[in-house]
Amino acid sequence: MMTGTIETTGNISAEKGGSIILQCHLSSTTAQVTQVNWEQQDQLLAICNADLGWHISPSFKDRVAPGPGLGLTLQSLTVNDTGEYFCIYHTYPDGTYTGRIFLEVLESSVAEHGARFQIP
């Protein structure tokens, strides 16, 4: 039975040209995290494998930095980066937990962080 929950940074906004940290946290489970995938829609951004470490997809290697922790830092943001991002926690023996973050990249300097929320 899957007992864990994923807490994410929720709905966030950032300025064009700036950077943002995408962060998820898995709690309420003793399952072992074997890998975390970061995806944007169906596109793989990065993988953090428990044994092999971080792997950044070639199309994002110049704009994505691993961390902090199991999070991901997006740099040199453009308006095209607006959209949904998913952290996918692969765990043993529970299975897969998924968290969702919505990022809005703004032209102006009125970027502010949204509230945190939980996904079961």
């Epitope: 990065a46 494998n49 950044i56 070639p58 692969h90």
Partner: antibody
Framework: QLQLQESGPGLVKPSETLSLTCTVS??????????WGWIRQPPGKGLEWIGS???????YYNPSLKSRVTISVDTSKNQFSLKLSSVTAADTAVYYC???????????????WGQGTMVTVSS | EIVLTQSPGTLSLSPGERATLSCRAS???????LAWYQQKPGQAPRLLIY???SRATGIPDRFSGSGSGTDFTLTISRLEPEDFAVYYC??????????FGGGTKVEIK
């Protein structure tokens, strides 16, 4: 579709370095989801994994061969290479390259293989 | 390392018969990391099963995999002439390193 092709000398002298290259066609070696691996098979025997590499150069090796193995990648040529130093007759084998799905988790396997190349170690 | 022991070493059967191949691990392996391959003489291995029970693309449904923990099985429900070959199991952990079983030869009786 994706194809892999091994190339290199079929005969290597004892104590020298075995060098092989795998050329990937029909797809990019710079795939975010896959490593690229080397496996060998001595005549009449089973399969032994040697090591694997990611497009960025990250590697993981079989500990029993690690001290003698170097695997490198050239994304501009869509190739990855194997070097095995200080070879002996025990290194005589068919050497295969294959796509390594270690990062795909529930699909972890070598799903696409080259046809293999025989390397004999002899003086 | 995790040692995979395959049995029997050789299986002598006739076309149309059922083949049951065993792969036993020296320590527990996640079923997600267990694969089966078929190899014919002079050819490269071909992936049959990944994740212990999922058929790879293009593999006929007469091939099925099962098992968990330390005991895994490959079953060929009705042997076709092209199924006579050597079969290998493989576990794909990183630490300890990935290993192959010694193989089971399925030969014509």
């Amino acid at each position: 579709q994706l194809q892999l092709q091994e190339s290199g000398p079929g005969l290597v002298k004892p104590s020298e370095t075995l060098s092989l290259t795998c050329t990937v066609s029909g797809g990019s070696i710079a795939s975010g989801s896959y490593y690229w691996g080397w496996i060998r098979q001595p005549p009449g025997k089973g399969l032994e994994w040697i090591g694997s590499i990611y497009y960025s150069g990250q590697t993981y090796y079989n500990p029993s061969l690690k001290s003698r193995v170097t695997i490198s990648v050239d994304t501009s040529k869509n190739q990855f290479s194997l070097k095995l130093s200080s070879v002996t007759a025990a290194d005589t084998a068919v050497y295969y390259c294959a796509r390594d799905g270690v990062l795909t988790l529930n699909k972890r396997s070598f799903d696409i293989w080259g046809q293999g190349t025989m390397v004999t170690v002899s003086s | 390392e995790i040692v995979l022991t395959q049995s029997p070493g050789t299986l002598s059967l006739s076309p149309g018969e059922r083949a049951t191949l065993s792969c036993r691990a020296s320590q527990s392996v996640s079923s997600s990391y267990l694969a089966w391959y078929q190899q014919k003489p002079g050819q490269a291995p071909r992936l049959l099963i990944y994740g212990a029970s999922s058929r790879a693309t293009g593999i006929p449904d007469r091939f099925s995999g099962s098992g968990s923990g330390t005991d895994f099985t490959l079953t060929i429900s009705r042997l076709e002439p092209e199924d006579f070959a050597v079969y290998y199991c493989q576990q794909h952990t990183v630490r300890p390193p990935l290993t192959f079983g010694g193989g089971t030869k399925v030969e014509i009786k």
